[in-house]
C-alpha cells in the first residue's frame, strides 16, 4: 500500500507527484524537489518535506530554552541534504560553502563552519518537547481529557504509538506535549517522533501537508481546542557542540 | 452513544473465505482505528490485527498475514475483516474492537460473528 | 512475540471477599512511566468489556471496587469486594507491541 489506488494522490503529503508507472500500474508517488519515491502509508521524513518545501518563505524564530541542551530552529528553511533514506544527512552545507551539522530533525547543532567541517554521525533527537499555548475558553479542558484527546490524535492521524507520548502536562494556557523514542526503542516501521512533531508543527499552522483533508479541528469533549502559539524544543542523545562566543 | 454492530454467523467449508462486517454509529468513524479479535470455542482471545479508519491500511498479526484482509468503508462506516483458505482451527467468535482514546486499549467490541468451518 | 501469563487459571472467592488476579509478561511494557497493559471482564456469551486501562485507570461506568496496580511486568487485578455479578473470567492485554497479546484467562467463580 503506498498510495490511494483509485485516483493516484498521496494521503500522507500532497507535496509529490503520483502516477501509475509502479510494478503492475500501482500508484507510485515522488516528492518534489527529490524526486524519491515517498511510502504514502506513513509520514514522509521532514527532510524530504523541507526539501520540497524550499519555494516557501523563511520561518525564523527565537525561543526560550527549557534546558541548557534543548535545541530550538532558529535558522528556518533550508534545502537540506537527504540520503537515500530520506533522512537528514548529518553535514549540511549552503551554496556559499557555509556547512553546518544536523540532528536528525534537522535543527543546527554546531557552530557553522567550512567544507573543513566534519559530522561524524547524524545525532538522534531522542526527546521533543512541543509547548502550546490555547486560546481562552470558558474553562480549562478536563487534563485527563485532553491527554487521551492528543494521544488519539498522534496515533490516528500521525501514526505514532502512543507510547512514544510520554506525557501531556497542562496548566492553562499552556499544554505541553513530550514525545520521546530512544534508538533501541524505534522498531521498522515506527515514525519517527520527528517527522510526526513536524506534521503536527504545520497542522497547527493551518499548513497541512496532508492531501485532500480538511485542516485539523482539535477538539477536547467537542470544545475546540485553539493553538495561538507553539515553541518546540528538540534533545539530543548527544548534547550539542555551540562555543561559548553563541551562548553569551 | 458509540455501537458496533457486527454481521450474522457463518458456517464455511474447508478452503472457503469468509467476510465478517462491522458497522460503526455514535462517534466520528475515521477518528479510531478498529481491532479484529477472534476467541476459538472455550479458547481465550487472539489479536488478529488492526485498520487505520483514517488511512484504510491495515497492521496484520503475522500468523494471519497473507490470509487475512482489513478494509473499510467510510460512505457506510463499516469495516470488513475476510479471512481465506479457511480450516477448522478457524471456527471461532471473531469480534471487533474500537480503539480507546489514549493506550490502545480496546474501549468498544462488537457482539462477535460466530463462523463455523465444517465439511 | 510479548507472553502473558496469568495467575491463578480458575479461582473462588465468597461474596464480600477480596478477589487478586496477577499477570506476568515477558518483558516490560512500560513506556516513560506509561504502562500499555489492560483488563478486561468476559461473561458467558458477550464480549469482553474493558475494565481497567493503562493498568491502574478504571474505564467510566467500571464499579470502583475494581483496581489494578503493578508496572513493568507484574501487574494485579483486585475485586475489593466480590459480587454475585462478577463471576466471568478475566484477561489482561498488553498493547505496547505488535502483536498484541492476552493473557489465558482467569476463571472467577464464588466459592
Known amino acids: 500500500h503506498t498510495a490511494a489506488q483509485d485516483n493516484c494522490t498521496c494521503p500522507t503529503n500532497k507535496m509529490t507527484v503520483c502516477s501509475p508507472d509502479g510494478p503492475g500500474g500501482r500508484c507510485q508517488c515522488r516528492a518534489l524537489g527529490s524526486g524519491m519515491a515517498v511510502d504514502c502509508s506513513t509520514l514522509t521524513s521532514k527532510c524530504l518535506l523541507l526539501k520540497a518545501r524550499m519555494s516557501a518563505p523563511k520561518n525564523a524564530r527565537t525561543l526560550v530554552r527549557p534546558s541548557e541542551h534543548a535545541l530550538v530552529d532558529n535558522d528556518g528553511l533550508y534545502d537540506p541534504d537527504c540520503d537515500p533514506e530520506g533522512r537528514f544527512k548529518a553535514r549540511q552545507c549552503n551554496q556559499t560553502s557555509v556547512c553546518w551539522c544536523v540532528n536528525s530533525v534537522g535543527v543546527r547543532r554546531t557552530d557553522k563552519g567550512d567544507l573543513s567541517l566534519r559530522c561524524d554521525e547524524l545525532v538522534r533527537t531522542h526527546h521533543i518537547l512541543i509547548d502550546l499555548r490555547h486560546r481562552p475558553t470558558a474553562g480549562a479542558f478536563n487534563h485527563s481529557d485532553l491527554d487521551a484527546e492528543l494521544r488519539r490524535l498522534f496515533r490516528e492521524r500521525y501514526r505514532l504509538h502512543p507510547k512514544f507520548v510520554a506525557a501531556v502536562h497542562y496548566e492553562q494556557p499552556t499544554i505541553q506535549i513530550e514525545l520521546r523514542q530512544n534508538t533501541s526503542q524505534k522498531a521498522a516501521g515506527d515514525v519517527d517522533i520527528g517527522d510526526a512533531a513536524y506534521y503536527f508543527e504545520r497542522d497547527i499552522k493551518g499548513e497541512s501537508l496532508f492531501q485532500g483533508r480538511g485542516g485539523l479541528d482539535l477538539r477536547v469533549r467537542g470544545e475546540p481546542l485553539q493553538v495561538e502559539r507553539t515553541l518546540i524544543y528538540y534533545l539530543d542523545e548527544i548534547p550539542p557542540k555551540f562555543s561559548m562566543k553563541r551562548l553569551t | 452513544q458509540v455501537q458496533l454492530v457486527q454481521s450474522g454467523a457463518e458456517v464455511k467449508k474447508p478452503g472457503a473465505s469468509v467476510k465478517v462486517s462491522c458497522k460503526a454509529s455514535?462517534?466520528?468513524?475515521?477518528?479510531?482505528?478498529i481491532n479484529w479479535v477472534r476467541q476459538a470455542p472455550g479458547q481465550g482471545l487472539e489479536w488478529m490485527g488492526v485498520?487505520?479508519?483514517?488511512?484504510?491500511?491495515?497492521s496484520y498479526n503475522q500468523k494471519f498475514k497473507g490470509r487475512v484482509t482489513m478494509t473499510r468503508d467510510t460512505s457506510t462506516s463499516t469495516v470488513y475483516m475476510e479471512l481465506s483458505s479457511l480450516r477448522s482451527e478457524d471456527t471461532a467468535v471473531y469480534y471487533c474492537a474500537r480503539y480507546g482514546d489514549g493506550y490502545n486499549q480496546f474501549d468498544y467490541w462488537g457482539q462477535g460473528t460466530l463462523v463455523t468451518v465444517s465439511s | 512475540d510479548i507472553v502473558m501469563t496469568q495467575s491463578p487459571d480458575s479461582l473462588a472467592v465468597s461474596l464480600g471477599e477480596r478477589a487478586t488476579i496477577n499477570c506476568r509478561v515477558s518483558?516490560?511494557?512500560?513506556?516513560?512511566?506509561?504502562?500499555?497493559m489492560h483488563w478486561y471482564q468476559q461473561k458467558p456469551g458477550q464480549p469482553p468489556k474493558l475494565l481497567i486501562y493503562?493498568?491502574?485507570n478504571l474505564e467510566s461506568g467500571v464499579p470502583d471496587r475494581f483496581s489494578g496496580s503493578g508496572s513493568g511486568t507484574d501487574f494485579t487485578l483486585t475485586i475489593s469486594s466480590l459480587q454475585a455479578e462478577d463471576v466471568a473470567v478475566y484477561y489482561c492485554q498488553q498493547s505496547y507491541e505488535d502483536p498484541y497479546t492476552f493473557g489465558q484467562g482467569t476463571k472467577l467463580e464464588i466459592k
Open positions: 455514535g462517534y466520528t468513524f475515521t477518528d479510531y482505528s
Open positions: 518483558e516490560s511494557v512500560d513506556s516513560y512511566g506509561n504502562n500499555f
Open positions: 485498520i487505520s479508519t483514517y488511512y484504510g491500511d491495515a
Open positions: 493503562r493498568a491502574s
